[in-house]
């Protein structure tokens, strides 16, 4: 089950908070580090903020990216860092805040053809496989070479958003990562709040489309915190 996957070798050697559970050395499968976890401190409140270890950008909040905290630091230790605002230096799209992308080393305002959520090619090297299959280090697949010559359609498996056709991003759904539509106005979105454990992120959503941001649904203000829905709304 996913629960045994979560406690297997690939996860148990991670730095806290992900490495807290006892592992099952005999597990046949393992999740890519940090993609799924039961609890943990990913959503700490800002005033009690602890760095969240990560292996790829999509494990971080919408306003964060995954990188080594120090320039030229140990590449094996990566945490979620605050995104770079417009006109700040960058090396890839995910470093730039929503609504921007990385062009010539600088975060610039997005146009329709540049979506947030790109994952670096090098990320796949840290997993060595299509990490949607949850079999971390058992084998190396050739999905990218045999499948991605055409852009993925809605619902097809993917490794990163660039594998998906225009208007789609790569997001986790159940046990895999698939191409999902970038969200439109009024659609439910996921707001990554640094607050309490948030359960398994097995239903990742795409980011909101151009000119939209993920905000609390107006008629849900009275609802309890846990049941509040966020939707994509005009800036």
């Amino acid at each position: 089950t996913l629960n045994s996957v979560l406690n297997s070798n690939a996860i148990k050697n991670l730095p806290p908070p992900l490495g807290g559970a006892a592992g099952h050395p005999g597990s046949a499968v393992s999740a890519a580090p940090g993609i799924l976890y039961p609890g943990g401190n990913k959503y700490q409140t800002i005033d009690n903020y602890q760095p969240y270890p990560c292996a790829e950008d999509e494990e971080c909040g919408t306003d964060e990216y995954c990188a080594s905290p120090t320039r030229g630091g140990d590449a094996g230790v990566q945490i979620c860092l605050a995104c770079r605002k417009r006109r700040k230096r960058c090396m890839r799209h995910a470093m730039c805040c929503p609504g921007n992308y990385c062009k010539n080393g600088i975060c610039v305002s997005s146009d329709q053809n540049h979506f947030r959520g790109e994952i670096e090619e090098t990320i796949t090297e840290s997993f060595g496989n299509d990490h949607s299959t949850l079999d971390g280090y058992s084998r190396r697949t050739t999905l990218s070479s045999k499948m991605y010559h055409t852009k993925g359609q809605e619902g097809s498996v993917c490794l990163r958003s660039s594998d998906c056709a225009s208007g789609l991003c790569c997001a986790r759904h159940f046990w895999s990562k698939i191409c999902k539509p970038v969200l439109k106005e009024g659609q439910v979105c996921t707001k990554h709040r640094r607050k309490g454990s948030h359960g398994l992120e097995i239903f990742q959503r795409c980011y909101c489309g151009e000119g939209l941001s993920c905000r609390i649904q107006k008629d849900h203000h009275q609802a309890s915190n846990s049941s509040r829905l966020h939707t994509c709304q005009r800036h």
């Epitope: 629960n3 079999d135 697949t141 055409t150 993925g152 619902g155 498996v157 659609q187 359960g199 239903f203």
Partner: antibody
Framework: QVQLVESGGGLVQPGGSLRLSCAAS????????MSWVRQAPGKGLEWVSV????????YYADSVKGRFTISRDNSKNTLYLQMNSLRAEDTAVYYC?????????WGQGTLVTVSS | DIALTQPASVSGSPGQSITISCTGT?????????VSWYQQHPGKAPKLMIY???NRPSGVSNRFSGSKSGNTASLTISGLQAEDEADYYC???????????FGGGTKLTVL
Amino acid sequence: QVQLVESGGGLVQPGGSLRLSCAASGFTFSSYWMSWVRQAPGKGLEWVSVISSDSSSTYYADSVKGRFTISRDNSKNTLYLQMNSLRAEDTAVYYCARHGIDFDHWGQGTLVTVSS
Amino acid sequence: DIALTQPASVSGSPGQSITISCTGTSSDLGGYNYVSWYQQHPGKAPKLMIYDVNNRPSGVSNRFSGSKSGNTASLTISGLQAEDEADYYCQSYDSPTDSVVFGGGTKLTVL
């Protein structure tokens, strides 16, 4: 257009075996996870199993674990369900479904009847 | 065992709006801002109507909408039409069993 056609259903005695097939067309079969979902006569839907696009991961409902095996042949665009140690409660219409963003396409189903 | 609870039946007149509820627990429906809905006419295969709480696949009428609050999800059909008469199933994910779960189904009758 997307088409899923199940076959292999029929009457089988308790304890017997059956192998269902699902022929897929109209989409890149090797790019999608696939599932089996069943529906007992007059009852609701019950998820049975799912297989990843490259066959490396499989999941099963507790009710069929250890008895059913899901598999696929991407070169033939075909999904399979090997059902062993069949019980009366396995009697149902078995649907194969494309597991894209949820079960976005379904076959017409094939009826499996387990009876002595 | 049915993990998600739906009313066995609901009814409405043409042009009316009806809502079908789907109640789960914190380990399934309540644990994720995620639920899907399927429509099934007698003798036919199910059809995906709503995914990710309130998203409609292309080709599905905008008379169908979804919402969720806490452990309960809802499917609302406005401007009820005769062809809406069918069984409706909600679907989510159950973390303890690591599996897909369906509701028991609701029979919608258009009077």
